[in-house]
Interface confidence: low
């Protein structure tokens, strides 16, 4: 999915309201400086394309993310605010399902949570110092 | 590993016209502003131009606009400096800069190219 | 447009801390990057965005900025660290990034 498209603000009001505490929250207990991070993104719609990936696609030591409730209200923002991303996600859920719904959190799972962090960071970074 | 290199330097007359260009690997080449920056023998930088991640907009520093292009080729990942009606005070080495792209703000410019001289001399 | 000013140079003894300043209206407003660069080399990143530091980049390099003048600070200088230093920012009014003139760091 291509993320030009998306209302950039209003995702990154979703993600100061709300989806920034639920981080949080699954990180409580770990130390800010536990996990160097390692993902980057280099401009909005890159974040995005990183975002979606580490928050939905399952990864070796971590498959139980898209659960979660970051994860929910990262796809409700994406599907009401970037154009056409809901049909593109057809298919992924249907494939999610099928996966076990054990919830295990992980080492790697609070690692892989502390790099979407930073590249939530770097979504919302500011075009400029306030004065 | 992420690398950028030049190449297209050379001596040219005033007025003529030359066109560099930079190679960029390791990285993902279409997410980053890409820009030029410049350094006259023994003086100190000068930035040149942007082109966007995707290429719908470029600037330019007042010094070269009019005569300096910046393009890109994402499937290619390669930047290109088209230089025309040259002048002896462009007389430079031209680095290639890769910048994070946020919209117009002020990203550093975190990887850069060893440079290319470009010498414009009668 | 936007004008920076570095001293031209600054000198500091091996294992003294060197000071280089970057002068410019109200840049504590501005984001403000450090690059160094040494001989015959290509410019390094060394502080972004006021005082955040590139993995890379040793811990005895820092930054800050306030008011009217934006500082790169080296600690326990090493000869190593004999270089040029420019501060830069973009200038959102004209919508160019400017250098600072530079300045020569020697390690006496």
């Known amino acids: 999915y291509d993320f030009t498209n998306c209302d950039f603000e209003k995702i990154k009001a979703a993600y100061l309201s709300t989806i920034s505490k639920d981080l949080i929250t699954y990180m409580s207990g770990t130390k800010s400086t536990e996990f160097n991070n390692t993902v980057s993104c280099s401009n909005r719609p890159h974040c995005l394309t990183e975002i979606q990936s580490l928050t939905f696609n399952p990864t070796a030591g971590c498959a139980s993310l898209a659960k979660e409730m970051f994860a929910m209200k990262t796809k409700a923002a994406l599907a009401i605010w970037c154009p056409g991303y809901s049909e593109t996600q057809i298919n992924a859920t249907q494939a999610m399902k099928k996966r076990r719904k054990r919830k295990v959190t992980t080492n790697k799972c609070l690692e892989q949570v502390s790099q979407l962090q930073g590249l939530w960071r770097r979504f919302n970074r500011p075009l400029l110092k306030q004065q | 590993q992420m690398q950028l290199v030049e190449s297209g330097g050379g001596v040219v007359q005033p007025g003529r016209s030359l066109t560099l260009s930079c190679a960029a690997s390791?990285?993902?080449?279409?997410?980053?502003?890409m820009h030029w920056v410049r350094q006259a023998p023994g003086k100190g930088l000068e930035w040149v131009g942007v082109i966007w991640y995707d290429g719908s907009a470029t600037h330019y520093a007042d010094s070269v606009k009019g005569r300096f292009t910046i393009t890109r080729d994402n499937s290619k990942n390669t930047l290109n400096l088209q230089m025309n009606s040259l002048r002896a005070e462009d007389t430079a080495v031209y680095y290639c800069?890769?910048?994070?792209?946020?919209?117009?703000?002020?990203?550093?410019?975190?990887?850069w190219g060893q440079g290319t001289m470009v010498t414009v001399s009668s | 447009s936007y004008v920076l000013t570095q001293p031209p140079s600054v000198s500091v003894a091996p294992g003294e801390t060197a000071t280089i300043t970057c002068g410019g209206a109200l840049i504590g407003s501005r984001l403000v990057h450090w690059y160094q660069q040494k001989p015959g080399q290509a410019p390094v990143l060394v502080i972004y965005d006021d005082s955040d530091r590139p993995s890379r980049i040793p811990e005895r390099f820092s930054g800050s900025n306030i008011g009217n003048t934006a500082t790169l600070t080296i600690s326990d200088v090493e000869a190593g660290d004999e270089a040029d230093y420019y501060c830069?920012?973009?200038?959102?009014?004209?919508?160019?990034?400017?250098f600072g003139g530079g300045t020569k760091l020697t390690v006496l």
């Open positions: 390791g990285f993902a080449f279409r997410t980053y502003g």
């Open positions: 800069v890769r910048a994070p792209q946020w919209y117009l703000t002020a990203e550093a410019f975190d990887l």
């Open positions: 830069q920012v973009w200038d959102h009014s004209s919508n160019t990034y400017v």
